[in-house]
Amino acid sequence: PPRGRILGGREAEAHARPYMASVQLNGAHLCGGVLVAEQWVLSAAHCLEDAADGKVQVLLGAHSLSQPEPSKRLYDVLRAVPHPDSQPDTIDHDLLLLQLSEKATLGPAVRPLPWQRVDRDVAPGTLCDVAGWGIVNHAGRRPDSLQHVLLPVLDRATCNRRTHHDGAITERLMCAESNRRDSCKGDSGGPLVCGGVLEGVVTSGSRVCGNRKKPGIYTRVASYAAWIDSVLA
């Protein structure tokens, strides 16, 4: 079987994650995203930092980035709404809402994902699914097809150890283990899904991947329910 996916994961079952989005810049994959409403995709604010004059679009219904697939469709972005408190030099509030130019055509391969509204930490050890088209090995190879990996949630105290993220993990962030299996470059903005519900969004900080002492950092969507609702309203 193929190895070294996402980092240490494997190729996802095609179209089994109908909420998965590829945020694209000038026709190339930039970041992950997650369809949270018919016309809205949630991603990471830092993803658009370098997008100044480029054309941002959202690909839905895709498994392969390059191959034709009946369910695939590229949507223009009507409006990009980064969280008002997101800043280039911090991982805090790293959320972005993209309004599609029209409502997505829903079907088996395109479907919004319910997101967590109850502001309570996911229990440490819970296995959560993260998926994306980010790099898959230490060479930096980028995959054509969607990859995924199951990661255990890591408690905040451990994640905040001096040897780990040294106090940077606020109550609005969560961590997942990163020992060889991890999200990595290009997975930013993608979903961390626990029990079929969106719990986190991959932050787009420039983090070393696959090192157990540098756990993956995810923005807790429940902590931003009010902001998400206000934008989607």
């Epitope: 193929p2 190895r3 070294g4 190339a28 370098d50 790099i135 898959v136 090995n137 230490h138 060479a139 930096g140 190879r141 980028r142 470059k185 290009g186 420039s206 983090r207 070393v208």
Partner: antibody, heavy 113, light 106 residues
Amino acid sequence: EVQLQQSGPELVKAGASVKMSCTASGFNIKDTYMHWVKQRPEQGLAWIGRIDPANGNIKYDPKFQGKATITADTSSNTAYLQLSSLTSDDTAVYYCTSAMDYWGQGTSVTVSS
Amino acid sequence: QIVLTQSPEIMSASPGEKVTMTCSARSSVSYMYWYQQKPGSSPRLLIYDTSNLASGVPVRFSGSGSGTSYSLTISRMETEDAATYYCQQWSTYPFTFGSGTKLEIK
């Protein structure tokens, strides 16, 4: 089209330093890792190290630690390799590669005494 | 560091012949890359993650293996396949190369 354009050949004196460049087109170097590989005349390949241009994180083969310095400038989409205290053992062709799938044409370095 | 030993060092094959070369690791690795290099040219990626064909590589090339033993096979040798072939492990820093197998045309 993805391309990696490396700087031209270098003839340098023993003990000196040299810095070569690798400019990418058709992709953003921040999106992957940039590696450097050494090949001495009539010999095999040796992995020197790699840089993650997005955060400056670098990994070297310990054999090249202190000899090689890898850097990147994301504004010009360019990776660099600097070699210091050159000896005849550093006479080689140096390749840059993105994710090991796209390769530059190589920069020939000749160290003269 | 992980030492990779390629064998044979030199081999020759006739057009149409099946060719297999091996790469053995001193300790277990999780996946292997294979490259082709012709004189005066840059290396070219052939196989990534042990068995996946890189873009534009003819389907006569294939890779297999696990643990400490990996191989590259050319199902039917063609004259343009005369080159030196290198394996490289991507499991453990530093990411070492094998010493190469030189394939000549008979």
